[in-house]
Interface confidence: low
């Protein structure tokens, strides 16, 4: 089928970077400025993506490939092909609808993006807390209390984590 189509359709001879111009007897015309065609046989060229505002250009548009964007400092990409930029927060914070808020007690975030996650509950694995958690770091679990030599002490386990979100910081 593809072979038959290519024999019948002169547009199939137009390579990437051109389009089959119906207004000019189906001649293969180069894509105009700020447009591209990434495959052959196209009847139109696609408009290049413009990286404006909070987006910045990671890769310039060419006649055969679209521009690629990333985000200006202080923001990070979200979605396929960096379709959105989302504000960075500091470690120890999460982005809420009201902006960056500190992680609630019992939760942490060690990245500039994403949500605060509950500290590991060491006791679920039969272990004790070796190093307390912070807003930026998870707790470090140590050996189980039974593994500790007599007289050794462990740090008090953390309180149960609360849901992150509405507590004013």
């Amino acid at each position: 089928f593809e072979r038959t189509r290519s024999l019948q359709d002169p547009c199939s001879n137009c390579p990437a970077g051109t389009f089959c111009d119906n207004n000019r007897n189906q001649i293969c015309s180069p894509c105009p400025p700020n447009s591209f065609s990434s495959a052959g046989g196209q009847r139109t060229c696609d408009i290049c993506r413009q990286c404006k505002g909070v987006f910045r250009t990671r890769k310039e548009c060419s006649s055969t490939s679209n521009a690629e964007c990333d985000c200006t400092p202080g923001f990070h990409c979200l979605g396929a092909g960096c379709s959105m930029c989302e504000q960075d927060c500091k470690q120890g914070q999460e982005l809420t609808k009201k902006g960056c808020k500190d992680c609630c007690f019992g939760t942490f975030n060690d990245q500039k993006r994403g949500i605060c996650r509950p500290w590991t509950n060491c006791s679920l694995d039969g272990k004790s807390v070796l190093v307390n958690g912070t807003k930026e770091r998870d707790v470090v679990c140590g050996p189980s209390p039974a593994d500790l030599s007599p007289g050794a002490s462990s740090v008090t386990p953390p309180a149960p984590a609360r849901e992150p979100g509405h507590s004013p910081q």
Partner: antibody
Framework: QIQLVQSGPELKKPGETVKISCKAS????????MSWVKQAPGKGLKWMGW????????TYADDFKGRFAFSLETSASTAYLQINNLKNEDTATYFC??????????????WGQGTLVTVSA | DIQMTQSPSSLSASLGGKVTITCKAS??????ISWYQHKPGKGPRLVIH???TLQPGIPSRFSGSGSGRDYSFSISNLEPEDIATYYC????????FGGGTKLEIK
């Protein structure tokens, strides 16, 4: 300094369409969401909704779904409010207001001067 | 939707005096309330955000307090330029303005 400058007053007939603008300057337009607020004569302020200025996604308050449309011209750092099929009760001053917390919610630190829309046969 | 009940709707006070306006939310708004001064023919002006944080350039005669569902806004040592309508705004979940309080000087 940060400024929001709105278009001038409009006199329209019922059933017509109006489109008012809010031109921002002094900051990166696509970094902060833009809300629209209505004040009918002798009444209080009423939040109409907001538009995310980098994704272009609008959110409308329940009372403003249907005839109301928010849009952007990011190259001109301008937000627009369009009201279709105008009714007498649309007579009001409309304000644009910039959120403080990026394209998220937050208090309004910056306001336009308002645009009076009068609907009268 | 969160409702904001603001009272009183109007009040009259003497120069040099003190007034207090209250806003009650229909649910806990976690201190996410701001207060605005609005004069005719102008855009509203932010006075206080996050319950009690004074906006730069606003005199310390203005103050705010509250928690949970109940919040208040006060102006002490009233001056002629304080004549305006004042609004509370919750921004905990979308936005809702209070009904406004028109302040007049006796």
């Amino acid at each position: 300094q940060i400024q929001l400058v709105q278009s001038g007053p409009e006199l329209k007939k019922p059933g017509e369409t109006v489109k008012i603008s809010c031109k921002a300057s002094g900051y990166t337009f696509t970094t902060y969401g833009m809300s629209w607020v209505k004040q009918a004569p002798g009444k209080g302020l009423k939040w109409m909704g907001w538009i995310n200025t980098y994704s272009g996604v609008p959110t409308y308050a329940d009372d403003f779904k249907g005839r109301f449309a928010f849009s952007l011209e990011t190259s001109a750092s301008t937000a627009y409010l369009q009201i279709n099929n105008l009714k007498n009760e649309d007579t009001a001053t409309y304000f644009c207001a910039r959120g403080n917390d990026g394209n998220y919610y937050g208090w309004f630190a910056h306001w336009g001067q308002g645009t009076l829309v009068t609907v009268s046969a | 939707d969160i409702q904001m009940t603001q009272s009183p709707s109007s009040l009259s006070a003497s120069l040099g005096g003190k007034v207090t306006i209250t806003c009650k939310a229909s649910q806990d708004i976690h201190n996410y309330i701001s207060w605005y001064q609005h004069k005719p023919g102008k855009g509203p002006r932010l006075v206080i955000h996050y319950t009690s944080t004074l906006q730069p350039g606003i005199p310390s005669r203005f103050s705010g307090s509250g928690s949970g569902r109940d919040y208040s806004f006060s102006i002490s040592n009233l001056e002629p330029e304080d004549i305006a309508t004042y609004y509370c705004l919750q921004y905990d979940n979308l936005y809702t303005f209070g009904g406004g309080t028109k302040l007049e000087i006796k």
